[in-house]
Interface confidence: low
Amino acid sequence: DAHKSEVAHRFKDLGEENFKALVLIAFAQYLQQCPFEDHVKLVNEVTEFAKTCVADESAENCDKSLHTLFGDKLCTVATLRETYGEMADCCAKQEPERNECFLQHKDDNPNLPRLVRPEVDVMCTAFHDNEETFLKKYLYEIARRHPYFYAPELLFFAKRYKAAFTECCQAADKAACLLPKLDELRDEGKASSAKQRLKCASLQKFGERAFKAWAVARLSQRFPKAEFAEVSKLVTDLTKVHTECCHGDLLECADDRADLAKYICENQDSISSKLKECCEKPLLEKSHCIAEVENDEMPADLPSLAADFVESKDVCKNYAEAKDVFLGMFLYEYARRHPDYSVVLLLRLAKTYETTLEKCCAAADPHECYAKVFDEFKPLVEEPQNLIKQNCELFEQLGEYKFQNALLVRYTKKVPQVSTPTLVEVSRNLGKVGSKCCKHPEAKRMPCAEDYLSVVLNQLCVLHEKTPVSDRVTKCCTESLVNRRPCFSALEVDETYVPKEFNAETFTFHADICTLSEKERQIKKQTALVELVKHKPKATKEQLKAVMDDFAAFVEKCCKADDKETCFAEEGKKLVAASQAALGL
């Protein structure tokens, strides 16, 4: 339904607090380098304008679209050209091209300093001195570093962030109370950002149909008792929500997400028995809870799929009448029966089914042609099962750190052109699949592992897209969304790669390594490991292990020395020479 003033409509629906927070997130996700104070000023101006429109929807400019209003506001930033370069050219365009232009300039890896956590007392003082500014700063810092973070979910994180400070800043031991909570928010935030990035990549690179297929499969697993029509309605609404958020339409997205949560809770009897707990919560918690809710139990005595999708003589007739609806029903029926499959596997099966029908429904005897289609599914199911089994065995044998190292070596050999920081980040995250998923029974491993790997490989794809260096990465990332993981798994050592020149500077370490946290020290060692493989891609596991063991001993020795810096300089030279000898460099 059309509103005279879109900005007034959203302000009234969301309330001033959420309106301001969402506009701040939107601006920070677009202009990632702008100082906090500049964004706050812009947000305040937009908010004051919105209030005039609430008072009188016919007032000047109140009828303009949100993109026009926000884009005009962003284009008033004086330093746009010097800070953002060609992004300033967006301002010469008209809507909707201007917004598309801003979206294209979102940077997944902005050149921003690492967020350093101040002392607890400093944070608590800042929180008490000006709670509103403190929380706005949190939204701003997260949004500019994660330009696709799911905005309504970021409001939920901010609410928890506020709750943590409210509770802990009056606790006897502030640090013991606060630091675990902040770690929790940080880790969950990174996971949430990566999951949302995959949704946006799915929509933007592969289109609405790809996202809807993903949503049908996931919601059918989660709500197996819901009818197909109900799942379809939820998929349509969810697609709208994510399309809006991924497109920068954060006010509409948050508003529609709230409506969807309301609808789900009002109709939970026909959706899932697991929603009761979620639906008793306040809005932000409710939406989060619904998004994470566990799968409902499968209905008893579901009939065999073969009857409707293989044995029926009407398969081709039903397919021809409404292809996407029929394939959607196939995906729904298959997914609700298989919570033990990953979503990407279910989508591969649906694609195989579609390809078979396309071929067979044009054949002389269609039924004869597609009668064995389910047999084609077996190898598709077995491939991820076997891969997960092998990798979980390796993880259990090595533990997380060494498992990450095995993946670092594996992926550096596959795609050695990729930057070292990206290879380290992605391989470390790939390695976390072990502790995340391998402890679970067979029936739960695949949805945990393969869908998590899809999220991590998407990180590789979006980082690589910014500065493409490997045709193999581009190929795996762009050919098929659901086959990305099998594509990367199938890559062998890149025989065309010319080894990197040996540079002793890369392997020069200083006493500062001694004061690093265990995680940061691991990253240093893993960075060295990637560089070693780039210098000597044909190095054996044994050679690499020997060098890494020497490196660990070298760090341990020099960190215990009285004159650490001298030790690192002298022993470092010996280590480089020994490593070159061990690797035959």
């Epitope: 675990p180 909570k181 929790e184 994470e292």
Partner: nanobody
Framework: EVQLVESGGGVVQPGGSLRLSCAAS????????MGWFRQAPGKERERVVS????????YYADSVKGRFTISRDNSENTVYLQMNSLRPEDTATYYC????????????????WGQGTLVTVSS
């Protein structure tokens, strides 16, 4: 090596109480959300309760709400399950589990598991 060791199980009459403990070692306890699952003979394992890393967020299954309470002591690396007003249908092996993230979803989100402690509610 990560270990989760449950204790406090036993036989109790309907309406009685028990307090289960789960002592964790080999992991940074305050970095893990904790949960209790249970499995009755011949039934699937189900999640009963969970608590976030900082203790600020809890989840209770409908069947135990108002009767069971989860708590944690990060200084002692221990999570507790206080079970009051026990019923025969609470009879099961209770498992303690640890998750890297706040786990509102399925059991596959939990990374580490204990061996379990048996609770029998019988008159």
């Amino acid at each position: 090596e990560v270990q989760l060791v449950e204790s406090g199980g036993g036989v109790v009459q309907p309406g009685g109480s028990l307090r289960l403990s789960c002592a964790a070692s080999g992991l940074t306890f305050s970095s893990y959300a904790m949960g209790w699952f249970r499995q009755a003979p011949g039934k699937e394992r189900e999640r009963v309760v969970s608590i976030s890393r900082g203790g600020g967020y809890t989840y209770y299954a409908d069947s135990v709400k108002g009767r069971f309470t989860i708590s944690r002591d990060n200084s002692e690396n221990t999570v507790y399950l206080q079970m009051n007003s026990l019923r025969p249908e609470d009879t099961a092996t209770y498992y303690c589990a640890a998750a890297r993230y706040w786990a509102t979803g399925s059991e596959y989100e939990f990374d580490y598991w204990g061996q379990g402690t048996l609770v029998t509610v019988s008159s």
